[in-house]
Interface confidence: low
């Protein structure tokens, strides 16, 4: 068998909401993957498991099952959404994400994704990790790959 290539493209969109009382930020982060099947037979994308970390803490997890199949020598682009919550000991980020006098509300998130594919009863797992910048101050739609190169402003302590 030839390889199945998984390429994490980046953040497609991030939609933000807030809980005033709990000083909590909710970020729904939609990511894009390119999965390429270099074989002369179809493969099934059985599941995608993803998690997002902020400051070494897991803030969101997602799992998609029975996603799609990819034909021979074909590529499919797959979007998946991870709901994340920045709260509790990270509630200091709340001011940072919502102040107008801060123009750039980008935070650094670690995106981890594992794709499980199957063909002829054989299962294969491919994992990727990538640091991405996400704006926690407003709803944002990114050009694909753009969130990798944004400037990030860390809050002043």
């Amino acid at each position: 068998p030839r390889s199945i290539d998984v390429k994490y493209i980046g953040v497609k969109s991030a939609y933000v909401s807030y809980d005033v009382q709990k000083r909590t930020i909710y970020l729904n982060i939609t990511n894009t993957l390119n999965i390429t099947n270099n074989n002369y037979y179809s493969v099934e994308v059985e599941n995608i498991t993803a998690q997002v970390q902020f400051a070494k803490t897991v803030i969101g997890k997602a799992r998609l099952n029975n996603i799609t199949h990819i034909g021979p020598l074909d590529m499919k682009q797959i979007d998946y959404t991870v709901p994340t919550v920045i709260a509790e000991e990270m509630s200091y980020m709340y001011d940072f994400c919502t102040l107008i006098s801060i123009k750039v509300h980008n935070i650094v998130l670690m995106m981890q994704v594992t794709v499980t594919t199957t063909y002829f009863g054989h299962s294969e797992q491919i994992s990727q990790e990538r640091y991405q910048y996400v704006d926690c101050g407003r709803n944002t739609t990114y050009q694909l790959g753009q969130s990798e190169y944004l400037n990030v402003l860390q809050p002043q302590q």
């Epitope: 807030y18 005033v20 009382q21 000083r23 709340y94 001011d95 940072f96 994400c97 919502t98 102040l99 107008i100 006098s101 801060i102 123009k103 402003l153 809050p155 002043q156």
Partner: antibody
């Protein structure tokens, strides 16, 4: 220690322009917004606008959009306000003040008194 | 634009007593993050303004705890307990929730 140094006074002719300076020291100039505030004799404070020295982004009060231009010189850690087409209404004390991302308007200059003479 | 109103141009107080200075905003200064973006400043005669209170109720560094700020989204109060001679001057509120930022017209504190 943090200081915002402004010249004490400027005497300018009616219809002319003037560029006032505010030299910052004792902190990282590009990490704080610089604001400009006007106070006419015996009157209250008016917010003119602010500038982010790191990239020169500005915000102005509508009233001062055609009157004031805010700039910075990062090499000398100095903020400037240029006032154009001066009239007697522009005779006032002009203060600079800094504010951080966490919003404390904690340091002010001593103010420059602008007198417009005909 | 947000309009800040200080209805009392002046207040008179006996040293040692308490006094309250009020300020209103034309719309709520309560942000989605739970903070209320209102400053109080004191300008003594012939001096630059000095920050007293930030985010409605937080005491600025070096300010005596005789000063306190309170309020709702649109109505705010600066309270000075045990007023001293050095407290005379003009007190200004200022909103910084939205551009353009704006000041109230000021309230002059005088001694009886």
């Amino acid at each position: 220690q943090v200081q915002l140094q402004q010249p004490g006074a400027e005497l300018v002719k009616f219809g002319a322009s003037v560029k006032l300076s505010c030299k910052a020291s004792g902190y990282t100039f590009t990490s704080f917004w610089m604001h400009w505030v006007k106070q006419r004799p015996g009157q209250g404070l008016e917010w003119i606008g602010n500038i982010d020295p790191s990239d020169s982004e500005t915000h102005y009060s509508q009233k001062f959009k055609d009157k004031a231009t805010l700039t910075v010189d990062r090499s000398s850690n100095t903020a400037y306000i240029q006032l154009s087409s001066l009239t007697s209404e522009d005779s006032a004390v002009y203060y600079c003040a800094r504010s951080s991302n966490w919003d404390n308007f904690d340091y002010w200059g001593q103010g420059t008194t602008v007198t417009v003479s005909s | 634009d947000i309009v800040m109103t200080q209805a009392s141009p002046s207040v008179s107080v006996t040293p040692g007593e308490s006094v309250s200075i009020s300020c209103r905003s034309s719309q709520s200064l309560l942000h989605v993050n739970g903070n209320t973006y209102l400053y109080w400043f004191l300008q003594r005669p012939g001096r630059s303004p000095r920050l007293l209170i930030y985010r409605m109720s937080n005491l600025a560094s070096g300010v005596p705890d005789r000063f306190s700020g309170s309020g709702s989204g649109t109505a705010f109060t600066l309270r000075i307990s045990r007023v001293e001679a050095e407290d005379v001057g003009v007190y200004y509120c200022m909103q910084h929730l939205q551009y353009p930022f704006s000041f109230g017209s000021g309230t002059k504190l005088e001694m009886k």
